[in-house]
């Protein structure tokens, strides 16, 4: 009988081992070892035994010892088990963004490593074990599926192999892949809320607000606001899980017509959009025309209001007849019409909304100068030593200058409070003068003396 010692060995790849082959008889006819491995006989051996050193053991092998004794030929094998840690442990790249609530498949590839019976592959989140499987195939591929929540954002996932050689009194060899950081996101199925004017006038400024709630991580969300081809530059305010983008928009005549207002919120690899139609319109203020802005009293004046062809106008609150973009009326200018405002209101329907524009013109009526009994009484009688205020108002446009003189030199203090004395008595010539001419009027002041008893 042939014996081999040790019958089983576990050794590192590339390692060497000494193996003893022995025969049961004292003087074997032949004794040796068959192996494809590099071998060296260690001398001296014994009568019935030989020692061999096997080197550079790269893979599992079963060298065979044989002996030929008088009672027959026999053989015995030694089982060489090679161990080595994997050459590659790699976690497949994670998606750039992973939606919350959707399962994530983790895939790990392991190249090499032996003995495979002792090689385990683990998928980890941080240091938490998600899955533990045997390494099967070359390369071994291990997968597991995990649900993804918001708390997985920024989590590191990795793959680890354990070559457990503790049954052989060796140790536990660990190899860990480079970690991959997961970026999760939650973009609600609801589109953003878009608040904007439905109609917008050329060369005016409007405000657009786009908001969306339930975003995670909100800081990574991007907002795109555009009106037609015009990209808007919003100011973004972030809440806990919400954002609000506010932008000012100014439109030009080239953009007149129906435009699409678009708000897109981009997070991860997904976008939620809201579109809204905005009608851009041009609506100049109506024109109010007076035949002449400045006329003399008694002159006939035509007041005319003209607006946008599709507008309807009202002139001084009176609608055009028939309703339309033009209205006019005729008047004979009186002093009372001086400073009178003529207001034209135009209304235009844009996308179902009524928009209004107003324009006002003032009429100047030239009249006078005038000195009336009502405003400049011809006779005053005042007690001596009483306090009085002489009043005389001249009228006209332009406003006339007024002078009241006695004997051409002594002025009547118009509008001033005076103590009535004898020298105030007399007849005054009041003269009102403007660029339109002059008028005069005599004003007599009588002073009553007190009675002494």
């Amino acid at each position: 009988q042939t014996s081999v010692f040790p019958p089983e060995v576990i050794l590192p790849r590339g390692g060497s081992v000494k193996v003893n082959c022995s025969a049961s008889c004292d003087q074997p006819i032949s004794l040796g070892m068959e192996t494809p491995l590099p071998k060296k006989e260690i001398l001296p051996g014994g009568n019935n035994w030989k020692m061999y050193e096997l080197s550079n053991v790269q893979e599992d092998s079963q060298p065979m010892c044989y002996s030929n004794c008088p009672d027959g030929q026999s053989s015995a094998k030694t089982l060489l088990t090679v161990y080595w840690t994997p050459e590659r442990v790699e976690l497949a790249p994670l998606p750039p963004w992973q939606p919350v609530g959707k399962n994530l498949t983790l895939r790990c590839q392991v190249e090499g490593g032996a003995p495979r019976a002792n090689l385990t592959v683990m998928l980890l989140r941080g240091e938490k074990e998600l899955s533990r499987q045997s390494a099967v195939g070359e390369p071994a591929e291990v997968t597991t599926t995990v649900p993804v929540g918001r708390d997985d954002h920024g989590a590191n996932f990795s793959c680890r192999t354990e070559l457990d050689l503790r049954p052989y009194v060796l140790k536990l060899f660990e190899n860990t892949s480079a970690p991959h950081q997961l970026q999760t996101f939650d973009l609600p199925a609801t589109p953003p809320q878009l608040v904007s004017p439905q109609v917008l006038e050329v060369d005016t400024q409007g405000t657009v607000v786009c908001s969306l709630d339930g975003l995670f991580p909100v800081s990574e969300a991007q907002v795109s606001l555009a009106l037609g081809d015009q990209k808007l530059n919003p100011t973004i305010t972030y809440g806990n899980n919400s954002l609000s983008a506010k932008a000012s928009v100014k439109v030009t005549a080239e953009e007149e017509g129906t435009q699409q207002l678009l708000c897109g919120v981009m997070l991860g690899n997904q976008t939620q959009e809201t579109r809204q139609t905005v009608t851009i319109y041009s609506f100049p203020a109506p024109n109010v025309n007076l035949t002449k802005p400045e006329v003399s009293e008694g002159t006939e004046v035509i007041v005319e209001c003209e607006a946008h062809p599709r507008a309807k106008v009202m002139l001084n609150g009176v609608p055009a007849q028939p309703p339309g973009p033009r209205a006019q009326f005729l008047l004979k200018a009186t002093p009372e019409d001086n400073g009178r405002s003529f207001s034209c209101s135009a209304t235009l329907e844009v996308a179902g909304q009524l928009v209004h524009k107003n324009q006002t013109r003032e009429l100047r009526v030239l009249y006078g100068p005038r000195l009336d009994e009502k405003d400049c009484p011809g006779n005053w009688t005042w007690p001596e030593n009483s306090q009085q205020t002489p009043m005389c108002q001249a009228w006209g446009n332009p406003l006339p200058q007024l002078k009241c003189l006695k004997d051409g030199t002594f002025p009547l203090p118009i509008g001033q409070s005076v103590t009535v004395t004898r020298d105030l008595e007399g007849t005054y010539l009041c003269q009102a003068r403007s660029t339109r001419g002059e008028v005069t009027r005599e004003v007599t002041v009588n002073v009553l003396s007190p009675r002494y008893e």
């Epitope: 081999v4 010692f5 040790p6 019958p7 089983e8 060995v9 576990i10 050794l11 390692g15 060497s16 081992v17 000494k18 003893n20 022995s22 035994w49 020692m51 050193e53 599992d60 015995a76 094998k77 030694t78 089982l79 088990t81 003995p115 019976a117 002792n118 050689l165 503790r166 049954p167 052989y168 009194v169 060796l170």
Partner: antibody, heavy 124, light 109 residues
Amino acid sequence: QSLEESGGDLVKPGASLTLTCTASGFSSSSGYYICWVRQAPGKGLEWIACIGAGSGAAYYASWAKGRFTMSKTSSTTVTLQMTSLTAADTATYFCARGGFVVGGGYGGYCFNLWGPGTLVTVSS
Amino acid sequence: AQVLTQTASSVSATVGGTVTISCQSSESVDVNNLAWYQQKPGQPPKLLIYSASTLASGVPSRFKGSGSGTQFTLTVSDLESADAATYYCAGGYSGNIFAFGGGTAVVVK
């Protein structure tokens, strides 16, 4: 991972007895050994035999050859058959798992997992 | 026959101290063949050191093995009361001869 011995008993001199070692948490594969070691009351440890988990090849201490036979009965059990027992065989019998540790050449057994032991008493 | 001799059957030391246990072999032992075990009453042995100086998994670094050829030593430093036990050396020899030393009891005071 654990080992458990069973079959220990009180027997008369000259009797035979079979001890069983059951492994759990690991299965048989090449490269490691299951061995039997005994300890007489108040005495030191004494190696009896080892069997290769993959090959089933058994090796004995010189004093145990012929009287003791070690066998692998399944991937998780090994037995030790003992014959012609004497009072000197009274001991706690441990089964142990070990490796044949190789570094720069020839190696040796060492045991990193032991069962709690089973008591064999040989007495008339 | 190959014999492993542990000269001291018992040694004592104080908590925090250091104890050294020697083991001598009648024949040269390859460094990979020598191991040290710790055994407490009523328990199976526990592997401490293998390949003369390699610490087994989970064993504190207070345990240190050294030596080669025929002379080997186990040193236990920063002694704890839990270190009170019997310590065995064990070696393997060419031709599948395996032996345990007689054991050294360590008393911690």
